[in-house]
Interface confidence: low
C-alpha cells in the first residue's frame, strides 16, 4: 500500500528511537570517515523533518523518497570532496544512480584507527554521564567499520551493549563483569558482520536467484516440516529484507524484518515446532532468535527422492513447465532430508541436477540419460567430508595457533601476491573453523565448517576486490559462489611467483612487542611467518619451524632482559643473519 509520505510511514512504524538509530547507522555506513558529531547533527535534522511529516504528510518534501531525502542530506556535508575524493561525484547524479554510486564507494577496509577499549571506570563514567551519546557512539563506530552490518541486528547488539553496562557498572568487580561480555559482543559482532557481508555479496555479485537458492536450502534444513509453498513465501520475504539492507534501505529493511518475524510467529504451527520460545521474546530478541533457531526434526518416513526426480517419466515435462520452481522443489526436498550437508554442498548438488536436466531433456532418451544423476552426487559429497575430516584431525593435533600457522603457510604459497595483513586475517579466521566446528558430531560438522569457510573466503574476496593483485583469487571469487571453497582448496603452490626481496626491516622488532596481548603477539609472529614464506616460498616446513622457534625464543629472551631495546637491536641482527643462513636467503 502506497503512503503519501514514506519517511512519516517509517517513523511511525519504527518509533523515534529506532528511526534515529537506523538513520545513524545508514549515514555512518555511507560516510565512514565523517566525525561522530557531524553524523549526529545530520540525524537530528532528518528526525526533525520526519516529525513535521508525521504531523502533516502533505508538508513540503514529505512526499520524496527516502533515498532522495537521505542522499540530499549526505550531499550537504561540506568536506565531502576532500574527505572522500571521487565519492563527491555521486552528488551530481540523480536517484536511483546516486544511491548506487554511494553503495559502490562503501569501503570494507576503511582506513580507521583500531578501536581501543578504555579502562572500565572510564567507560562506566561515560555511560552514566550521557547514556544516549554513549550508545550512539557504539552504533556509529561499528557501522562505519562494518558498512554492510545487518542494521536491525546491530540494534539488538546495542541493546545487549547497554544491558552489559547497566548491570556491570554497579557490580562490585566491574571489570570481571563487563570485560567478558564486551569480548563476547565483539566476537559475535565480527561473525555477524561477516555473515551478512556474504549475503550482500551473494545478492550484489551473483543476483537474487543465487540468494534465493541459498535461502531455500537453509530454510528447508531449518524448517523441514514446512510445506514447499510456505518455505517459498519465507524465502521471498527474506530476500526482500536482505535486498533492502544490502541496498542501504535500512528503515524499510528493519520494518520488513519485524513483519516477517510477526508472520513466522503467527504461523509457527505450519513452520516449525522450535519457534515457541523465540516468539515469546521482545521484537529485537525475537528476530535474532528466529534467525538462529535450531533445525526442527525431520518428518518421519519421507519418501525417496528418486521417485519424483529420477524415476518419474514427467521429470522433463515438469522441468520445462517451470524450471526454477521444479529446481526449487528439488532443493527443498534434498535440503530437508539433509541437515548434515552444508548449504553450499546442497547448492552444488542442485546445480549438477540442473546441468544434467538441461543436457538430458534435449536427448533422444531423456530418462536413460538422467537415470544415474544421483551417482554423480557421491564425489561431491565425499570431497567436503574428507576435507573436514583431515582438517579436524590436524586441528586436534596442532591446536588453534599452530593450525592457523599451517593454513598461513598453505595460503601464502597458493596466493603469495595477496597483502600480508589480509593473509594473516583470513588464515587466522580459517583456522578458527577448528575450535568452532570440530567439537561437533559428524552430522553437524559439514554445515558448520563449510558454510563458515564460505563466510571467511568471502572476506578474502571482498578485500581482494578493493585492490586486485592475484588472477587466481579473482577467478575463485567470481566464477561460482558455491565453488569458491573447492576452488581455493584445489589451488597448488603458485610456481609463477617471484620471491619478494629480503628486507631486514620487516624482521626488525622492538620492545613494544613485550606489552602486547597474547593475541597481538601471535599476529606479529604470524605476520613474520607470511613474510618468510613470501621471501622463500620453497622453504620446507622444518626450515620455517626452526626459524619461528628461534624467533619465539628471541622475543622471550629480550622481553626478560633489563635493557629490552638493546637486546632487540643486537639479538635481532643475529636472528636475521641466522634466519637468512637457515633459509638460504
Amino acid at each position: 500500500d502506497a503512503h503519501k509520505s514514506e519517511v512519516a510511514h517509517r517513523f511511525k512504524d519504527l518509533g523515534e528511537e529506532n528511526f534515529k538509530a537506523l538513520v545513524l547507522i545508514a549515514f555512518a555506513q555511507y560516510l565512514q570517515q565523517c566525525p561522530f558529531e557531524d553524523h549526529v547533527k545530520l540525524v537530528n535534522e532528518v528526525t526533525e523533518f520526519a516529525k513535521t511529516c508525521v504531523a502533516d504528510e502533505s508538508a513540503e518534501n514529505c512526499d520524496k523518497s527516502l533515498h532522495t531525502l537521505f542522499g540530499d542530506k549526505l550531499c550537504t556535508v561540506a568536506t565531502l570532496r576532500e574527505t572522500y575524493g571521487e565519492m563527491a561525484d555521486c552528488c551530481a547524479k540523480q536517484e536511483p544512480e546516486r544511491n548506487e554510486c554511494f553503495l559502490q564507494h562503501k569501503d570494507d577496509n576503511p582506513n580507521l584507527p583500531r578501536l581501543v577499549r578504555p579502562e572500565v571506570d572510564v567507560m562506566c563514567t561515560a555511560f552514566h554521564d550521557n547514556e544516549e551519546t554513549f550508545l550512539k557512539k557504539y552504533l556509529y563506530e561499528i557501522a562505519r567499520r562494518h558498512p554492510y552490518f545487518y542494521a536491525p541486528e546491530l540494534l539488538f547488539f546495542a541493546k545487549r551493549y547497554k544491558a552489559a553496562f547497566t548491570e556491570c557498572c554497579q557490580a562490585a568487580d566491574k571489570a570481571a563483569c563487563l570485560l567478558p561480555k564486551l569480548d563476547e559482543l565483539r566476537d559475535e559482532g565480527k561473525a555477524s558482520s561477516a555473515k551478512q557481508r556474504l549475503k550482500c555479496a551473494s545478492l550484489q555479485k551473483f543476483g537474487e536467484r543465487a540468494f534465493k537458492a541459498w535461502a531455500v536450502a537453509r530454510l528447508s534444513q531449518r524448517f523441514p516440516k514446512a510445506e514447499f509453498a510456505e518455505v517459498s513465501k519465507l524465502v521471498t520475504d527474506l530476500t526482500k529484507v536482505h535486498t533492502e539492507c544490502c541496498h542501504g534501505d535500512l528503515l524499510e529493511c528493519a520494518d520488513d524484518r519485524a513483519d516477517l518475524a510477526k508472520y513466522i510467529c503467527e504461523n509457527q504451527d505450519s513452520i516449525s515446532s522450535k519457534l515457541k520460545e523465540c516468539c515469546e521474546k521482545p521484537l529485537l530478541e525475537k528476530s535474532h532468535c528466529i534467525a538462529e533457531v535450531e533445525n526442527d526434526e525431520m518428518p518421519a518416513d519421507l519418501p525417496s527422492l528418486a521417485a519424483d526426480f529420477v524415476e518419474s517419466k514427467d521429470v522433463c515435462k515438469n522441468y520445462a513447465e517451470a524450471k526454477d520452481v521444479f529446481l526449487g522443489m528439488f532443493l527443498y526436498e534434498y535440503a530437508r532430508r539433509h541437515p548434515d550437508y552444508s548449504v553450499v554442498l546442497l547448492l552444488r548438488l542442485a546445480k549438477t541436477y540442473e546441468t544434467t536436466l538441461e543436457k538430458c531433456c534435449a536427448a533422444a532418451d531423456p530418462h536413460e540419460c538422467y537415470a544415474k544423476v544421483f551417482d554423480e552426487f557421491k564425489p561431491l559429497v565425499e570431497e567436503p567430508q574428507n576435507l573436514i575430516k583431515q582438517n579436524c584431525e590436524l586441528f586436534e593435533q596442532l591446536g588453534e595457533y599452530k593450525f592457523q600457522n599451517a593454513l598461513l603457510v598453505r595460503y601464502t604459497k597458493k596466493v603469495p601476491q595477496v597483502s600480508t595483513p589480509t593473509l594473516v586475517e583470513v588464515s587466522r579466521n580459517l583456522g578458527k573453523v577448528g575450535s568452532k566446528c570440530c567439537k561437533h558430531p559428524e552430522a553437524k560438522r559439514m554445515p558448520c565448517a563449510e558454510d563458515y569457510l564460505s563466510v571467511v573466503l568471502n572476506q578474502l574476496c571482498v578485500l581482494h576486490e578493493k585492490t586486485p593483485v592475484s588472477d587466481r583469487v579473482t577467478k575463485c571469487c567470481t566464477e561460482s559462489l558455491v565453488n569458491r571453497r573447492p576452488c581455493f582448496s584445489a589451488l597448488e603452490v603458485d610456481e609463477t611467483y617471484v620471491p619478494k626481496e629480503f628486507n631486514a626491516e620487516t624482521f626488525t622488532f622492538h620492545a613494544d612487542i613485550c606489552t602486547l596481548s597474547e593475541k597481538e603477539r601471535q599476529i606479529k609472529k604470524q605476520t613474520a611467518l607470511v613474510e618468510l614464506v613470501k621471501h622463500k616460498p620453497k622453504a620446507t616446513k622444518e626450515q620455517l619451524k626452526a626459524v619461528m622457534d628461534d624467533f619465539a625464543a628471541f622475543v622471550e629472551k629480550c622481553c626478560k632482559a633489563d635493557d629490552k631495546e638493546t637486546c632487540f637491536a643486537e639479538e635481532g641482527k643475529k636472528l636475521v643473519a641466522a634466519s637468512q643462513a637457515a633459509l638460504g636467503l
Partner: nanobody, 124 residues
Framework: EVQLVESGGGLVQAGDSLRLSCAAS????????MGWFRRAPGKEREFVGA????????WYTDSVKGRFTISRDNAKNTVYLQMNSLKPEDTAVYYC?????????????????WGQGTQVTVSS
C-alpha cells in the same frame, strides 16, 4: 633433524601378540603425528595407523582395527604399536614415521621422517 629407531620385531605364531616401539631423538617437537606403515613382500608400503601428538586421537586401517593399538609416551619420545591376534598377512617390515600432519595421515607424503624399519614375521 629427527631420528627414528624401531624395535620389537621378530618371529611369532599366528594369534600371538607383539609390541613394537619407535624412539625419536634429535629435533623433536610435540605437534608431530606419529604413524606406522608396513611393506609386505612384493607389495607397496601401506598405512597401518597413526596417533596424534597428544595421544588422544588414533587412526587405523580397516584390516587392523580392533587388533592393533597405537599409543605414545611424550616424556620418553616413544610411540608403541601393540599388535594382538596376529595373522600371517601381517608379515611385513614395519616403519615408524613422523610428520606435522597437514592433510590426511594415511599418505606417505605427509610424513617428513622415517625409521629404517623392523621385520615382523607371523607363521601359521
Amino acid at each position: 633433524e629427527v631420528q627414528l629407531v624401531e624395535s620389537g620385531g621378530g618371529l611369532v605364531q599366528a594369534g600371538d601378540s607383539l609390541r613394537l616401539s619407535c624412539a625419536a631423538s634429535g629435533r623433536t617437537y610435540t605437534p608431530y603425528v606419529m604413524g606406522w606403515f608396513r611393506r609386505a613382500p612384493g607389495k607397496e608400503r601401506e598405512f597401518v595407523g597413526a596417533v596424534s601428538w597428544s595421544g588422544t586421537n588414533t587412526w587405523y586401517t580397516d584390516s587392523v582395527k580392533g587388533r592393533f593399538t597405537i599409543s605414545r609416551d611424550n616424556a620418553k619420545n616413544t610411540v608403541y604399536l601393540q599388535m594382538n591376534s596376529l595373522k600371517p598377512e601381517d608379515t611385513a617390515v614395519y616403519y615408524c614415521a613422523a610428520g606435522d600432519g597437514v592433510g590426511i595421515y594415511r599418505y606417505e607424503h605427509q610424513y617428513d621422517y622415517w625409521g629404517q624399519g623392523t621385520q615382523v614375521t607371523v607363521s601359521s
